[in-house]
């Protein structure tokens, strides 16, 4: 058992047909010795009395808000909270496992350039008595300081017959240097609360490894005089860290067509500009990464060739 | 060329080699597009290797100051990782394809850090730790962990470069 | 010199299982990922499965998911195809092959057995 | 997954001609990650080409391999008799897959 928070209990128990389970001691927060009595959430029922209680926790029945009393006045409250191990594997069952990049990954985060800010998103299909708080660090054996705001419910979907949750946070690394070269990954800890469940989940990465720049702004087509070209140009996100002679893009351009199916031509430039063939009822479309690290391309920013 | 004594490095043959060394190392470690056939294992084996860190002076304030003690940092690291494609760590089995992107990488760091240092001119190197696996599967994974690092170092290298021929070129 | 030689191949019913082994010689074999492809007669080369050099990383064709499991003994240098509820479109010649490194994970197929014949037939 | 379309299906040629034999990839595969391999009747393939352009050990210089993004060639300057056979290409950059084959056969 440990502490969560203040008044606040994590029992790890393993979880298996007819396990033993966890025998925990509460005691109450009072300097009173006597005539105290022990209750469970809402029932009346007393289960002890005493300024410890003993009691065998093995499963969420025996988890909830125990309450210590005299006298009718409540004296403290001690809330335990289960987090699962099923074949020595905690429990997962908070979180939708979004297998992005790969199977497992419950936490995704990214960042908009170098500045040490990020944001993290996670899944979900649970809408009710959930609470999630976030912390992070630089490191894990010396930590240095990272800030995370609170998680907020960002988006609501339909996935077939059921509702899927999207909560993000977004943090900021206290003393970032954007030149630098990372050699500690940033740590990002979630912990899951669901009713009595408890669950945590990790994330380890380098924020050049999450980098996810926006879409190229201005985005503007200038037609050439007799001629099928029409020359695009762009400008560089205004999120995008500076200068840009050190901090530098790489471009894709694309022309393409209505149909899916079309074949795409593609042309890949460090500049700002570029010549294309504009088809007609074509799109033409541009996106961004960093020019000396592959990280994830941006989104596309489009506009129609006519 | 960069030497002791402060003269400029040609800032632009660096941009391009260094953008071409981030090329390389991409190629030689792509990270995406295909199967992960390393094995999983200790992470602690890289952590020697050489960081542009923040106090190195190669952000574009501590460029304009005095560019060479992070032209000092990066030549640093482009012999360490030389000497590192150039061991036993690569060239023992599994051997690689002849024509493996490891190989162009290995001449390019030679080449970038002779540009940054003529002969007849020493700055000091950092000792290579012995990184030397008893295991042909450790060295795969050695090569991984290498290559991984050796992309982050050059992308700082390559921005360095690229700043410099932008803004102090003569 | 390098060497695979694959054996094990045979007639076979429908349902039923087989294992196919490669022995391996003239190479580092632990250090290697190693293939199975398959070539049903007179067609081309479909990809079966690869395990990496120390087993513990496995893929398989869609396939011949959930019925096939690739496996190696690196101290008996021999790589293993346990084939289960084989099915008439199984039928093909399965050659092992070995991965040569092209980048620091993957590459081109670099040797080949010359192949052991599986026919699924009632 | 990528889909790998070689044409011509077949190929008929005499010794001494250029041969050119071209691999379509369904979507962009890195120039590093394209192998092609030869394949006799009654024998396994051998590799004659990796990164799309490098010649594997052993292989006569009248192999050549070029392309990127999508399009490959795989060029033989002046067939010789033993050249003729089944040529397949292959990516091995996003899983594993090979083309339908061209058979090269003596005009």
């Known amino acids: 058992i440990w502490e969560l928070k203040k008044d606040v209990y994590v029992v790890e128990l393993d979880w298996y047909p007819d396990a033993p389970g966890e025998m925990v001691v509460l005691t109450c927060d009072t300097p009173e010795e006597d005539g105290i009595t022990w209750t469970l959430d809402q029932s009346s029922e007393v289960l002890g009395s005493g300024k410890t209680l003993t009691i065998q926790v093995k499963e969420f029945g025996d988890a909830g808000q125990y309450t210590c009393h005299k006298g009718g006045e409540v004296l403290s409250h001690s809330l335990l909270l289960l987090h699962k191990k099923e074949d020595g594997i905690w429990s997962t069952d908070i979180l939708k496992d979004q297998k992005e990049p790969k199977n497992k990954t419950f936490l995704r985060c990214e960042a908009k350039n170098y500045s040490g800010r990020f944001t993290c998103w996670w899944l979900t299909t649970i809408s009710t008595d959930l609470t999630f708080s976030v912390k992070s660090s630089r490191g894990s054996s010396d930590p240095q300081g990272v800030t995370c705001g609170a998680a907020t419910l960002s988006a609501e979907r339909v996935r077939g017959d059921n509702k899927e949750y999207e909560y993000s946070v977004e943090c900021q690394e206290d003393s970032a240097c954007p030149a630098a070269e990372e050699s500690l990954p940033i740590e990002v800890m979630v912990d899951a609360v669901h009713k009595l469940k408890y669950e945590n989940y990790t994330s380890s990465f380098f924020i050049r490894d999450i980098i996810k720049p926006d879409p190229p702004k201005n985005l503007q087509l200038k037609p050439l005089k007799n001629s099928r070209q029409v020359e695009v140009s762009w400008e560089y996100p205004d999120t995008w860290s500076t200068p840009h002679s050190y901090f530098s893009l790489t471009f894709c351009v694309q022309v393409q067509g209505k149909s899916k199916r079309e074949k795409k031509d593609r042309v890949f430039t460090d500049k700002t500009s570029a010549t294309v063939i504009c088809r007609k009822n074509a799109s033409i479309s541009v996106r961004a990464q960093d020019r000396y690290y592959s990280s994830s391309w941006s989104e596309w920013a489009s506009v129609p060739c006519s | 060329r960069a030497v002791p004594g402060g003269s400029s490095p040609a800032w632009t043959q660096c941009q391009q080699l260094s953008q071409k060394l981030c090329t390389l190392a991409w190629s030689a470690h792509p990270l995406v597009g295909h199967m992960d056939l390393r094995e999983e294992g200790d992470e602690e084996t890289t952590n020697d290797v050489p960081h542009i860190q923040c106090g190195d002076g190669c952000d574009p304030q501590g460029l304009r100051d005095n560019s060479q003690f992070c032209l000092q940092r990066i030549h640093q690291g482009l012999i360490f990782y030389e000497k590192l494609l150039g061991s036993d760590i690569f060239t023992g089995e599994p051997s690689l394809l002849p024509d493996s992107p490891v190989g162009q990488l290995h001449a390019s760091l030679l080449g970038l850090s002779q540009l940054l240092q003529p002969e007849g001119h020493h700055w000091e190197t950092q000792q290579i730790p012995s990184l030397s696996p008893s295991q042909p599967w450790q060295r795969l994974l050695l090569r991984f962990k290498i290559l991984r690092s050796l992309q982050a170092f050059v992308a700082v290298a390559a921005r360095v470069f690229a700043h410099g021929a932008a803004t102090l070129s003569p | 010199q390098v060497q695979l030689v694959e054996s094990g191949g045979g007639v076979v019913q429908p349902g039923r299982s087989l294992r196919l082994s490669c022995a391996a010689s003239?190479?580092?074999?632990?250090?290697?990922?190693m293939h199975w492809v398959r070539q049903a007669p007179g067609k081309g080369l479909e990809w079966v499965a690869v395990?990496?050099?120390?087993?513990?990383?496995?893929y398989y064709a869609d396939s011949v998911k959930g019925r096939f499991t690739i496996s190696r003994d690196n101290s008996k240098n021999t790589l293993y195809l346990q084939m289960n509820s084989l099915r008439a479109e199984d039928t093909a010649v399965y050659y092992c092959?070995?991965?040569?490194?092209?980048?620091?994970?993957?590459?081109?197929?670099?040797?080949w057995g010359q192949g052991t014949l599986v026919t699924v037939s009632s | 997954e990528i889909v790998l379309t070689q044409s011509p299906g077949t190929l008929s040629l005499s010794p001494g001609e250029r041969a050119t034999l071209s691999c379509r990839a369904s979507?962009?595969?890195?120039?590093?990650?394209l192998a092609w391999y030869q394949q006799k009747p009654g024998q396994a393939p051998r590799l004659l080409i990796y990164?799309?352009?490098s010649r594997a050990t052993g292989i006569p210089d009248r192999f050549s391999g070029s392309g990127s993004g999508t399009d490959f060639t795989l060029t033989i300057s002046r067939l010789e008799p033993e050249d003729f056979a089944v040529y397949y290409c292959?990516?091995?950059?996003?899983?594993?897959?090979f083309g339908q084959g061209t058979k090269l056969e003596i005009k």
């Open positions: 092959a070995r991965m040569g490194y092209y980048d620091i994970l993957t590459g081109p197929f670099d040797y």
């Open positions: 003239g190479f580092s074999f632990s250090s290697y990922a």
């Open positions: 395990i990496s050099y120390g087993g513990s990383k496995k």
């Open positions: 979507q962009s595969v890195s120039s590093s990650y």
């Open positions: 990164g799309a352009s």
């Open positions: 292959q990516q091995y950059g996003s899983s594993y897959t």
